[in-house]
């Protein structure tokens, strides 16, 4: 009876989760109900005695199919080209770091770090992002100047809503500029890079929200927030893109013990967003203008906007006082790019549908690793590629566009039996000439099967060997696009394939 009841509950809870998804309930609500469903299923499993081993990837991870990899490679290509265009070098660091390296760098997010089980040696943790390892790398190598990019997987013990492109193992694409430079020039370049990449990817309209940690801290100070509560109130403010001010206020007052009038004063500020005119307006604010930190931050933002205008991206940037990125290491400018969903009603503002890139200035992080506390100013950005992959994949599915998963230029086929040796010789010649070529691994494949494979794989050309053609010293070259078939002299084949696939001269 107990098992039957549990089974019914699993069925009901499953239907409940599906219903919530259809109603487009909040991610957190869906996540909680999915967690409940998993707990119910686990109880069912325990009830069976020994649980059956289910073949699956761990929670929050996924495999990439060839189609998904093709999408991913294209996205990475756009990003890497942009990073290189801006003169970045590339580095790599270990997937795991000493636990101590990551400790105390992420504030409230530290609970999401994966610690490795102690094997009797060093205490290790999987990297949570690429920024802290970068700071460790700079300090360790006593570097004071570098412009680098780093693309690698990071690990977070989040409870991810994987449908929204969030995972426990995911790629980050980081670009950072380390060094002592004149204010806001590297910061502006980071924003320019972010805009270039997001525009190139053509994933839709986006907006980059900009703020400054010093403005936030100054604002909290003038509003009467105790120093000890700055960071925790910051994380509440950062939720404003997801929940209403009322809910944020309730959290500040009810859970974090802030006085309601202090919360109201914060509310007057954090609900404002605009451009350079808002920066100027706040510089005149009777309270903020008396706070040194806030004035410094506002002064830098004013300068930043001047550079953004010169870079031609000021229309993509919004100064948003509610932006309060959760990581503890930011010290100056912070920014976050969100994809915009166009408004359903005329006159409404476009709606942000999740962060796709973010970053900021972190001048103190390297100093945390330096025995003498020497600081190396840094500013950088991170592209949220997993979310971008999801968006691109969804778009491709909707358009039913065919995605090529190989780069093969030509399939080597034969029209008659007993021509395996000739096919092997020809495909080898093509490989040696740097042509991407394939053949079917059968001694006597049917021509129809070969042509079917050629079409399905989206290979542009097929080279068909026949007995007559061999005698005449030619190969039939057929194009998938034009359907035309031409006889090409064997010695001209490589050149003809190159010409038809616009491939420059290259060898292995």
């Amino acid at each position: 009876a107990d098992r039957a009841a549990l089974e019914e509950l699993v069925r009901l809870q499953g239907a409940h989760v599906r219903g919530l998804k259809e109603q487009k309930a909040s991610a957190e609500q869906i996540e909680e109900e999915v967690t409940k469903l998993l707990k119910l299923k686990a109880q069912l499993g325990q009830d069976e005695g020994k649980q059956k081993f289910v073949l699956k990837t761990p929670k929050g991870t996924r495999d990439y199919s060839p189609r998904q990899m093709a999408v991913r490679e294209k996205v990475f290509d756009v990003i890497i080209r942009c990073f290189k265009r801006h003169g970045a070098e590339v580095i790599d660091t270990p997937v795991f770091e000493l636990k101590e390296t990551l400790t105390g760098k992420y504030g409230e997010d530290s609970k999401l770090i994966y610690d490795l089980k102690d094997q009797g040696g060093e205490l290790l943790s999987l990297r949570y992002d690429l920024t802290v390892p970068f700071a460790r790398y700079l300090a360790m190598n006593k570097l004071t100047n570098i412009k680098r990019y780093h693309i690698a997987k990071v690990y977070r013990r989040d409870n991810p809503a994987m449908t929204r492109g969030r995972y426990r193992e995911f790629y980050q694409c980081d670009f950072d500029i380390a060094g002592q430079f004149d204010p806001m020039i590297p910061d502006a370049e980071c924003l320019k890079i972010m805009c270039e990449i997001l525009s190139s990817l053509q994933i839709g309209n986006f907006l980059v929200k900009v703020n400054d940690r010093r403005i936030l801290d100054g604002m909290f100070a003038v509003c009467g927030v105790p120093d000890s509560k700055f960071r925790t109130i910051c994380s509440s403010v950062d939720k404003l893109d997801k929940v209403s001010w009322e809910e944020v206020k309730n959290e500040m007052v009810g859970e974090k013990g802030l006085a309601p009038e202090v919360a109201d004063r914060i509310g007057d500020y954090v609900q404002q967003h605009g451009g350079v005119s808002l920066v100027e307006q706040l510089l005149q604010d009777p309270k903020l203008s008396q706070n040194k930190q806030a004035v410094e931050g506002l002064g830098d933002l004013k300068l930043l906007f001047e550079y953004l205008i010169l870079f031609g991206i000021d229309d993509k940037i919004s100064f948003d006082l509610s932006l309060a990125r959760g990581l503890d290491y930011y010290t100056g400018v912070i920014y976050e790019a969100v994809l915009l969903q166009m408004p359903t009603q005329a006159g409404e503002e476009p709606l942000g549908v999740g962060s796709i890139a973010a970053g900021g200035r972190y001048d103190g992080l390297v100093g945390m690793f330096d025995p003498k506390g020497r600081k190396v100013p840094c500013v950088g950005l991170s592209i949220g590629v997993e979310r971008i992959f999801s968006i691109v994949e969804q778009r491709l599915e909707a358009s039913e566009e065919k995605v090529r998963t190989t780069e093969t230029q030509v399939l080597v086929a034969s029209a008659q039996k007993k021509l395996l040796e000739e096919r092997l010789k020809l495909v080898s010649e093509l490989w040696d000439a740097g042509i991407k070529a394939e053949l079917l691994y059968k001694k006597n494949p049917k021509l129809l099967n070969q042509l079917q494979y050629w079409e399905e794989a989206g290979i542009p050309l097929v080279a068909i060997i026949g007995e007559q053609e061999l005698r005449d010293g030619v190969i039939k070259l057929r194009s998938v696009a034009s359907r035309e078939e031409v006889d090409v002299r064997r010695e001209d084949l490589v050149e003809e394939i190159r010409r038809r696939t616009n491939q420059p001269l290259s060898t292995c």
């Epitope: 509950l9 967690t35 707990k39 119910l40």
Partner: antibody, heavy 120, light 107 residues
Framework: QVQLVESGGGLVKPGGSLRLSCAAS????????MSWIRQAPGKGLEWVSY????????KYTDKVRGRFTISRDNAKNSLYLQMNSLRAEDTAVYYC?????????????WGQGTLVTVSS | DIQMTQSPSSVSASVGDRVTITCRAS??????LAWFQQKPGKAPKLLIF???NLESGVPSRFSGSGSGTDFTLTISSLQPEDFATYYC?????????FGQGTKLEIK
């Protein structure tokens, strides 16, 4: 056997605070969602708040949100309800209750209740 | 919030009688409904969960049925210990709400 024992109730003036505790035994406390349900004298039952097994999720009814805070200490097998800015309408017997099958919002085990009286 | 309405608010019956109490939800709640029994000065006791499942240790004279918005608790043959107040509760969405109660009295 499953046992839930509430404590911390009493008489308090409007605007005052109280902290209710619930000691759990006889089951793996850290596996279960837990809740506080109250019943005003001579009235019906009202679900006040709940907390998930690992404290990731908490919810409150509109009447108490911003004033009450639910928390738990799995190491001590204890559930708590911090009640601030108390009002006369918060007067009730407060029951600590365990979720059915760990996660279903139906209370399959209840404490004996602790009376909270808010009066000047 | 989902409103739960019980009827009747009180009922008088004798030992051996068959008694039916109904509960209506203001919107569909699938089978997310429970029935509780409460005696004066005591905590409620779970009788039925997800509309029709009998909680272990509860006598089989208690049964539940319904789905969507209309639900029923039936006691097939009243026993002296069954005189109490009965509550229904929806567990579909927070805030989880109870009916106003049905008092079952001795005739």
């Amino acid at each position: 056997q499953v046992q839930l024992v509430e404590s911390g109730g009493g008489l308090v003036k409007p605007g005052g605070s109280l902290r209710l505790s619930c000691a759990a035994s006889g089951f793996t406390f850290s596996d279960y969602y837990m809740s506080w349900i109250r019943q005003a004298p001579g009235k019906g039952l009202e679900w006040v708040s709940y907390i998930s097994d690992k404290s990731r999720y908490t919810k409150y009814t509109d009447k108490v949100r911003g004033r009450f805070t639910i928390s738990r200490d799995n190491a001590k097998n204890s559930l708590y309800l911090q009640m601030n800015s108390l009002r006369a309408e918060d007067t009730a017997v407060y029951y600590c209750a365990r979720y059915l099958y760990q996660v279903i919002a139906i209370a399959d085990a209840w404490g004996q209740g602790t009376l909270v009286t808010v009066s000047s | 919030d989902i409103q739960m309405t019980q009827s009747p608010s009180s009922v008088s019956a004798s030992v051996g009688d068959r008694v039916t109490i109904t509960c209506r939800a203001s919107q569909g709640i699938s089978s997310w409904l429970a029935w509780f029994q409460q005696k004066p000065g005591k905590a409620p006791k779970l009788l039925i969960f997800v509309a029709s499942n009998l909680e272990s240790g509860v006598p089989s004279r208690f049964s539940g049925s319904g789905s969507g918005t209309d639900f029923t608790l039936t006691i097939s043959s009243l026993q002296p210990e069954d005189f109490a107040t009965y509550y229904c509760q929806q567990a579909e969405s927070f805030p989880y709400t109870f009916g106003q109660g049905t008092k079952l009295e001795i005739k």
